[in-house]
Amino acid sequence: VPRWRQQWSGPGTTKRFPETVLARCVKYTEIHPEMRHVDCQSVWDAFKGAFISKHPCNITEEDYQPLMKLGTQTVPCNKILLWSRIKDLAHQFTQVQRDMFTLEDTLLGYLADDLTWCGEFNTSKINYQSCPDWRKDCSNNPVSVFWKTVSRRFAEAACDVVHVMLNGSRSKIFDKNSTFGSVEVHNLQPEKVQTLEAWVIHGGREDSRDLCQDPTIKELESIISKRNIQFSCKNIYRPDKFLQCVKNPEDSSCTSEI
């Protein structure tokens, strides 16, 4: 007789999830010498231990502590790039500007990027059929709690000038309900962070409006200022071209008005 299984509203665990996590861990530790000491089997065991046999609406940050400990990593605290609703460009950017880091450039972020996972209460099975949706089911699900935990730690580690890439094509350029707006902004440490510098990425080809004057950016400025952190903002009107110019600043098209 088939066991009754809870049907959640979100997609199920990514297929070949254990193999993917393990393979990513091995690849990452090979590429990053400072993480060569990491035992990837232990990392997978700790990852699995955070959600297997637990109700997928009852996950806590505490569940992820063994994984956090194994994935402890030092990135230059003054070279951190946060992002909101513009992940692909942020990642393209750190591939060019190799001395800056997004969360997904760290081991733990790299392991989980674009993956979904959950288990079931009292069974050691991984649920490949469905997982809880943050809105429709519950917020304390394995994926959401993981990203909340690693995002908080990443923001807490930041110092000096912290950069954030924001999507200027969205109705809310700064969204208080995003991970950046709800977690990272509130976990920047004013005693370490001097300035938050927002880069507003334009979508339209001929869009030369100053999106730094957008009401949601003013709201972000207000939140940051109240936390005794300075705020600055710049428009990136041509992200494709900007990326090229970061890669090759000598290119005459970066400065020539013709």
Partner: nanobody
């Protein structure tokens, strides 16, 4: 707070020279690309020259061979040596700083602007 203080502007005859300075505070100067822009009355601000944190330089075509940009990281200051000045160089000159790269303004704003210094070249 980040501050960029431009100075050294003035009036000069065509063929003369001026040296502009931009003193920076509140930022890790040696990590920043620095640049100069200029704005003629009724026109848009335009790129003049930039110097990267590595020391590499870029110039607008119209000033190549006449202007030299430099920086002194120990003094947190950037300079623009302007020789063989022409009446068409008359403008308000602004310094700028950016963590990454200084581009023309149709691509991206710099992270920080200084206030302007007036340069007037008469024939």
């Amino acid at each position: 707070d980040v501050q960029l203080q431009a100075s050294g502007g003035g009036s000069v005859q065509a063929g003369g020279s001026l040296r502009l300075s931009c003193a920076a505070s509140g930022l890790s100067f040696s990590d920043y690309a620095m640049g100069w822009f200029r704005q003629e009355p009724g026109k848009e601000r335009r790129f003049v020259a930039s110097i990267r944190s590595s020391g590499g330089t870029t110039y607008a075509e119209s000033v190549k061979g006449r202007f030299t940009i430099s920086r002194d990281n120990a003094k947190n200051t950037m300079y623009l040596q302007m020789n063989n000045l022409k009446p068409e160089d008359t403008a308000v000159y602004y310094c700028a700083a950016d963590r990454l790269v200084i581009t023309k303004l149709s691509i991206a704003d710099p992270g920080y602007w200084g206030q302007g210094t007036q340069v007037t070249v008469s024939s």
